[in-house]
């Protein structure tokens, strides 16, 4: 049996087209060798009538195309201007027309019946514009001309020459009457209703010699597309609704019980809570079209969504729509991460992110969602060693644990860093996931100095005490920059005493930088880990200066507060920069966020994917 | 929403017709906007392909069998009662299986035998071919 796949029998009639599908198994061979089609003889051979070489017999000259789409497993063959003649059995295969590697397709070309009643069919789509062209001739060219709506067996005026327009219809319809040369009318619907569909009658003239045309009008609900995402996951919708409305107010609403359709998202700056830090409405472009990004899916995400264009901002009779059926696969391979992670104020979080580990090369991103306007995500770092200036020192992106997760670690931390975050790569965007960031009441567990001055040829100390809850732990001590925190030596000075009610177990740990040297400024980081896990961290800037008297430093928690020096921040950081990305693509699939990591200076980033499941922000 | 409710089914001799009918209804569109098939299902196997029906327009449409069922089959509709027929000949006991009619707008863009690509489904009716 031919693993070639087809339609067995194909019909139409004369003058109109055909287009046949045939599909193969696209291995590589298959992919690349000769497709064709051809015309059974009554001797048995195959006559070769247009091939995917650029054979095409002169029966198909000027009126056909074979066109492979070996990607799909399929090629297909179109045939305009069909005449009875063509009605036979054909073959599409691939190789040599005798191997057998082919299916049999029996074409059928009847006579045109013409249109029935002279009845020219509309097809258009909900919400949409439709013209109806209405021929009359020169004796009527100054008579009343009109359109009719038949409703049951009457006919029911919907607009005329003399300015009547029906209720149903006010404020979408028009006639316009074309120019002396052209013995045409035409009404033009705008925002189509489902119950503008039917029979319409067009006439101009009310006499005995006055021309009429029949029109039937078929106004057609888009049916949903079907996508499947996995839970814990990203969806994007793209929403082309066309040029004619790119400047009126867009919406995705999710229909709930009955015709009800709750708005989700619109560009009127209404957002459902349940969304809250989780979506982004990404810039219309010039043609109207946009998408709706939507991470964190939950299983209660599932369900019918619309997008559509409305001066309201929200469904509404006449609104062109566009339909998805969300699926939410809760056998997700998305593996689950803390949705919530906590930190105190002048503490630290370490959040986990999960990436599709079969792209442990791409680029890895942290942003935060903003909701104003219509939400975007500015970046904050990369894992190409970019980092948003305001967060110089206090934020790191690390490829660890790797195997499908990184680590993001942010320290100073204030009120204002509360929010919604997101993790991303540049390779699938499915895998966007989001967390929020919460800022509870609270003391750092882990006690540095606030800032620390340096001599340049001395050597300095700089203590951190960790509470005996991080017995256990790793303790480490590493020098911050652009692409990480790299560890340095450290002592441990036995235990610290700086925590009350704390044993043994807790333990002063030391940094010590012998010589100092100007390249020795800048942020260090002490922080407990266990294996490639990361916990606490707590900053300090050291800042070097010339010698002013000898000897070494040593300092000690009392010449500093235990809240992180904040004098690196901007005054204006809350401030949202109009520098943030905005390119629309830059949450769909076409463009890896890097490209526009240079206009990504806007404030922070956020997440929220809502559930419970919350970590606290000095362990795992 | 689309609903489609099949009949036709039940107890037939080797060798014996069916004809299978499934009726539709429910769409704003008209009937010829969509693809209609039949697919089945015997029991411990899984869904297969058994044949469809594609309009291009109220003139143009395609008709689709699977392999193992060539030459007793014919896949038919009357557009004005929204009704899709499956007329199958010479029935074989392995023929034995619940039919479901099913139904997409999704046009001639995708491989008629993949049954991710029906939207609508019907709850089937029961084939049974004895020997």
């Known amino acids: 049996k031919s693993p070639i796949f087809g339609p067995e029998e194909v019909n139409s009639v004369e003058g109109n087209s055909v287009s046949i599908t045939c599909y193969y198994p696209p291995t590589s061979v298959n992919r690349h060798t000769r497709k064709y089609w051809c015309r059974q003889g009554a001797r048995g051979g195959c006559i070769t009538l247009i091939s995917s070489e650029g054979y095409v017999s002169s029966k198909y000259a000027g009126r056909a195309n074979l066109t492979n789409f070996p990607e799909n497993g399929t090629f297909v063959v179109n045939i305009a201007q069909l005449s009875q003649d063509d009605s036979g059995r054909y073959k599409c295969g691939l190789g040599i027309n005798s191997r057998g590697l082919s299916f049999d397709v029996s074409l059928e070309v009847s006579q045109g019946p013409g249109l029935l009643n002279d009845t020219k069919v509309y097809t258009v789509d909900l919400g949409r514009t439709v013209t109806i062209n209405c021929p009359f001739k020169t004796e009527n060219a100054q008579k009343r001309k009109s359109l009719y709506k038949q409703i049951g067996l009457y006919p029911v005026l919907v607009i005329d020459s003399s300015g009547y327009v029906n209720p149903n219809y006010t404020g979408r319809i028009r006639l316009d009457i074309q120019g002396t040369g052209q013995l045409l009318f035409s009404v033009v619907i705008n925002q189509l209703r489902l119950s503008d569909a039917g029979q319409y009658l067009c006439q101009a003239g009310d006499d005995s010699n006055s021309n009429k045309k029949n029109a039937d009008l078929q106004v057609l609900k888009p049916e949903p597309e079907l996508v499947y995402e996995d839970l814990r996951g990203s969806v994007t919708f793209h929403c082309a609704l066309g040029p004619e409305v790119a400047n009126v107010a867009k919406f995705l609403c999710r229909q709930s019980s009955g015709e009800n359709c709750d708005v989700v998202v619109n560009t009127l700056g209404k957002r459902a809570p349940a969304f809250e830090g989780r979506i982004l409405l990404n810039p219309q472009d010039k043609d109207g079209s946009f998408s709706v990004v939507i991470t964190g899916l939950r299983k209660e995400d599932a369900g019918r969504y619309l997008c559509g264009a409305h001066s309201d901002g929200q469904l509404q009779e006449g609104s062109p729509i566009q339909a998805w059926q969300l699926f939410v696969n809760e056998e997700s391979t998305i593996p689950r991460s803390p949705t919530v992670v906590k930190g105190v104020a002048g503490g630290s979080v370490a959040v986990l992110c999960p990436y599709n580990r079969k792209e442990s090369k791409s680029i890895k991103y942290w942003c935060l969602w903003e909701g104003a306007q219509n939400g975007r995500c500015p970046l904050l770092v990369d894992s190409e060693g970019w980092v948003k200036a305001q967060y110089e020192g206090r934020l790191s992106l690390l490829e660890e644990p790797g195997n499908g997760t990184f680590t993001v670690i942010l320290n100073q931390l204030t009120s204002r860093d509360a929010g919604f975050y997101w993790c991303l790569t540049n390779g699938d965007t499915l895998w966007r996931t989001t967390v929020e960031i919460k800022i509870i009441e609270g003391e750092p567990n882990l006690k540095v100095p606030g800032n620390v001055t340096a001599v340049l040829g001395e050597t300095l100390k700089v203590p951190c005490h960790f509470p005996c809850k991080f017995s256990s732990y790793e303790k480490y001590w590493c020098k911050w920059n652009n692409t990480g925190c790299q560890a340095l030596p450290s002592q441990d000075e036995g235990p610290s005493k700086a925590f009350v009610n704390c044993d043994e177990n807790s333990r002063l740990v030391s940094l010590t930088l012998n010589l100092v040297t100007r390249a020795d400024e800048g942020w260090y980081w002490c922080g407990v880990k266990q294996g490639h896990f990361y916990g606490e961290t707590a900053a300090v800037y050291v800042a070097v200066e010339e010698r002013k008297a000898a000897g070494s430093r040593d300092v000690s928690l009392a010449k500093a507060d235990a809240a992180p020096d904040e004098k690196v921040l901007d005054s204006g950081f809350r401030e949202i920069e109009n520098k943030a990305i905005q390119d629309p693509r830059l949450f769909a699939e076409e463009k890896a966020v890097a490209d526009t990591r240079d206009q990504a200076d806007g404030s922070r980033a956020s997440v929220d994917s809502g559930s419970s499941e919350e970590q606290g922000g000095s362990s795992r | 929403e689309v609903q489609l409710v099949e009949s036709g089914g039940g107890l037939v001799q080797a060798g014996g017709s069916l004809r299978l009918s499934c009726a539709a209804s429910g769409s704003g569109r008209t009937f010829t906007s969509y693809t209609m098939g039949w697919f089945r299902q015997a029991p411990g196997k899984e869904r297969e392909f058994v044949s469809a029906?594609?309009?291009?327009?109220?003139?143009?449409?395609?008709?689709y069998y699977a392999d193992s069922m060539k030459g007793r089959l014919t896949i038919s509709r009357d557009n004005a009662k929204n009704t899709v027929y499956l007329q199958m000949n010479s029935l074989k006991p392995e023929d034995t299986a619940v039919y479901y009619c099913v139904a997409t707008g999704r046009g001639l863009t995708y491989d008629p035998r993949d049954r991710r690509k029906y939207d609508y489904w019907g709850q089937g009716t029961q084939v049974t071919v004895s020997s």
């Open positions: 029906l594609t309009w291009a327009d109220d003139s143009t449409y395609y008709k």
